[in-house]
Interface confidence: low
């Protein structure tokens, strides 16, 4: 999906209002310095591509974050503010339902969500120069 035509300010507002808090809740008890940010993004569409990938694609050691509150709110924000996004996700959602597993918060998932926090912060500050 090409995130170029999303309403970035509306997505930013959604992040500020709820998603950021849900990410913090997920990470509660984990110090912010525990993980190094290794994933970055260069502009807002790129950030949303990386955010979608980390949020919804299973990875080794972290089977699925898609049922977490922050993920559901992320999906809703993208569906509302990115034209045509929800249509591209129908097949992915059906596949995810078939392989739903018990929720387990692994260290790998915590690391992944820490990366997500960094990506969201970058998304919110698009004029900040890359470090």
């Amino acid at each position: 999906y090409d995130f170029t035509n999303c309403d970035f300010e509306k997505i930013k507002a959604a992040y500020l209002s709820t998603i950021s808090k849900d990410l913090i809740t997920y990470m509660s008890g984990t110090k912010s310095t525990e993980f190094n940010n290794t994933v970055s993004c260069s502009n807002r569409p790129h950030c949303l591509t990386e955010i979608q990938s980390l949020t919804f694609n299973p990875t080794a050691g972290c089977a699925s974050l898609a049922k977490e509150m922050f993920a559901m709110k992320t999906k809703a924000a993208l569906a509302i503010w990115c034209p045509g996004y929800s249509e591209t996700q129908i097949n992915a959602t059906q596949a995810m339902k078939k392989r739903r597993k018990r929720k387990v918060t692994t260290n790998k998932c915590l690391e992944q969500v820490s990366q997500l926090q960094g990506l969201w912060r970058r998304f919110n500050r698009p004029l900040l120069k890359q470090q």
Epitope: L16, S17, T18, S20, K21, R121, N124, R125
Partner: nanobody, 127 residues
Framework: EVQLVESGGGLVQAGGSLRLSCAAS??????????IGWFRQAPGKEREGVSC????????YYTDSVKGRFTISSDNAKNTVSLQMNSLKPEDTAVYYC??????????????????WGQGTLVTVSS
């Protein structure tokens, strides 16, 4: 667009007082489950968390160096968060920013990442 505008800074003698205000536009403090706070950055130094207030229950947190001197408060009707600063010291000199994308808890406000949405307000304390 989400914006935060800080005001109330200025030049003050050591021992004096200032009241900083942070006004929000584009969203309403009362509507969301925010932690709202202040941080500062002195010339040549890293940003430091100063204080924050939980919008869930009104709990307040302060970094050790300002405890007993600074008081944070929120006014949801006016959509503002204020920082009353008393007994100011030269080491309080800095640009002060308010932020909403923060989390305050018993770890202390200084351990969290702040995003400076506003331009900040300069506080200068002369000896």
């Amino acid at each position: 667009e989400v914006q935060l505008v800080e005001s109330g800074g200025g030049l003050v003698q050591a021992g004096g007082s200032l009241r900083l205000s942070c006004a929000a536009s584009g969203f309403t403090f009362a509507d969301y489950d925010y932690d709202i706070g202040w941080f500062r950055q002195a010339p040549g130094k890293e940003r430091e968390g100063v204080s924050c207030i939980s919008n869930r229950d009104g709990s307040t947190y302060y970094t050790d160096s300002v405890k007993g001197r600074f008081t944070i408060s929120s006014d949801n009707a006016k959509n503002t968060v204020s920082l009353q600063m008393n007994s100011l010291k030269p080491e309080d000199t800095a640009v002060y920013y308010c932020a909403v994308e923060i989390h305050c808890d018993d770890y202390g406000v200084e351990n969290f990442d702040f995003d400076p949405w506003g331009q900040g307000t300069l506080v200068t304390v002369s000896s």
